[in-house]
C-alpha cells in the first residue's frame, strides 16, 4: 500500500506519458488520477514503467473499480494483465473476443498461468458455449486445447464450431472425447458431398458408430489403416468382410500387418473363415 500524500505543485498528471516514469511510487499515487488512467490505458504499454510503478497503477484501478474493471479498461491492460490475480479476473465480465485475444497476446510465450486459465474459463462461461471464433483463437494460441477439455465441457461445443477444428487439434483426444465430438462433426459436415465429407470427418471417426461405418463403406472412401485402427472396436466388430473391404478399398492389404492388433484381431475372430479367405490375405479366424 502506498501512503496517501498530497501531489507536489506542478506534478499533477494531465495525461499518461513518458514523464511519469520519473515519478516515485508515492508521486504516481498522489498525482495520477485513476479516471484519467482508465481512459488512457492504451498508453501505459508504450511506457517502460517498472514493476513497482505498475503495482501503483493497478492499485489505482482497483480503487476506482472495486467490483471489477469494465471491459473498456480490460481490453487495454496490456502488460498490466500479468499483475492481475485470478481473484481479480473472476470479477470481470469479458465478452469481446478482441479483449481475449489482446490478453492472450500479452501472455504469449509465457506459461498458461492461473490468470489465463481463469480468463478463458470466465470468457467461455460468459458466452455459454465454445463458439467457432473462440475455439479458433484458443487452438491458435494453445494447440491441443480442445483435447484438454473433458467430454462434459466438449458437449458445450456447437456443431458450427467444428469447422474451426484442424486434424492436429484432435491428435491427443481419447475415445470418450471423440464420442462427443463425432456427432457434432457429422452434423456440421452433413451437406458436403461424399469425398469432401470423408476428408473432413476422417479425424473424428474414432467416435463413429457401426451404422455410419457401414454407410461410409458404400461411398468408395478408401480409408487408410491408421484411421481404421483408431475406430471403436465395438463399431468395427459387426462389419462384414465385404463392408471392410469396401471401406478400406486398396488399403485392405494392410489388414495382414495388423492382424494381431485391436480392432483388427477382434474383428477377424468374429468372421467366418470362408469370408476371410475371399480377401486372399491369409487371415486366420
Amino acid at each position: 500500500e502506498v501512503e496517501k500524500t498530497a501531489c507536489p505543485s506542478g506534478k499533477k498528471a494531465r495525461e499518461i506519458d513518458e514523464s511519469l516514469i520519473f515519478y516515485k511510487k508515492w508521486e504516481l499515487e498522489a498525482c495520477v488520477d485513476a479516471a484519467l488512467l482508465a481512459t488512457q490505458m492504451d498508453r501505459v504499454n508504450a511506457i517502460p514503467f517498472t514493476y513497482e510503478q505498475l503495482d501503483v497503477l493497478k492499485h489505482k484501478l482497483d480503487e476506482l473499480y472495486p467490483q471489477g474493471y469494465p471491459e473498456s479498461v480490460i481490453q487495454h491492460l496490456g502488460y498490466l494483465f500479468l499483475k492481475m490475480s485470478p481473484e481479480d479476473i473472476r470479477k470481470w465480465n469479458v465478452t469481446s473476443l478482441e479483449t481475449l485475444k489482446a490478453l492472450l497476446e500479452v501472455n504469449k510465450g509465457h506459461e498458461m498461468s492461473p490468470q489465463v486459465a481463469t480468463l478463458i474459463d470466465r470468457f467461455v462461461k460468459g458466452r455459454g458455449q465454445l463458439d467457432k471464433d473462440t475455439l479458433d483463437t484458443l487452438t491458435a494460441f494453445y494447440p491441443g486445447y480442445l483435447c484438454s477439455l473433458s467430454p462434459e465441457e466438449l458437449s458445450s461445443v456447437p456443431p458450427s464450431s467444428i469447422w474451426a477444428v484442424r486434424p492436429q487439434d484432435l491428435d491427443t483426444c481419447d475415445p470418450r472425447q471423440l464420442d462427443v465430438l463425432y456427432p457434432k462433426a457429422r452434423l456440421a459436415f452433413q451437406n458436403m458431398n461424399g469425398s469432401e465429407y470423408f476428408v473432413k470427418i476422417q479425424s473424428f471417426l474414432g467416435g463413429a458408430p457401426t451404422e455410419d461405418l457401414k454407410a461410409l463403406s458404400q461411398q468408395n472412401v478408401s480409408m487408410d489403416l491408421a484411421t481404421f485402427m483408431k475406430l471403436r472396436t465395438d463399431a468395427v466388430l459387426p462389419l462384414t468382410v465385404a463392408e471392410v473391404q469396401k471401406l478400406l478399398g486398396p488399403h485392405v492389404e494392410g489388414l495382414k500387418a495388423e492382424e494381431r492388433h485391436r480392432p483388427v484381431r477382434d474383428w477377424i475372430l468374429r468372421q467366418r473363415q470362408d469370408d476371410l479367405d475371399t480377401l486372399g490375405l491369409g487371415l486366420q479366424g
Partner: nanobody, 121 residues
Framework: QVHLVESGGGSVQAGGSLRLSCVAS????????MRWYRQGPGQVRDWVSS???????SYTDSVKGRFTIAQDKGKNTVYLQMNSLQPEDTAMYYC???????????????WGHGTQVTVSS
Amino acid sequence: QVHLVESGGGSVQAGGSLRLSCVASGYRNCRSTMRWYRQGPGQVRDWVSSIYTDGTTSYTDSVKGRFTIAQDKGKNTVYLQMNSLQPEDTAMYYCRIDLVGCNVAGGSPYWGHGTQVTVSS
C-alpha cells in the same frame, strides 16, 4: 524436461486388486490431462482411462465399474485403482500426460516407461 514415473504393478490372482501410481514432474502452470493406457503382449497401446483438467473422468467400457482414476494435484500424482482384476487385464500399464500452455522441452504428450500388471487365473 517432463518426467513420468509409474509404480504399483505386480502379480495378482484373478479377482484381486492393485493400485497404480504415476508421479509427474518438470512442468507447472498449464492445463494437464492425465491418462492411463495399457499394452498387452503383441498388442498396440489401448486407452484405459482419463482424468481431465476439470477433474471429471472417463473409462474404456471393459474396465468401467472396476477401475477408478483419481489425482492428487498437490503431489502431481495420478492413481489407477484396479479391482476385480481379470486375466485379460494383464498388460504393461503406461501413464501419459498431455500439457497445454506451458513452456517445457520436448512435445506433449509425454509417456512413462510403464509398470507391468500380471493377472493369473
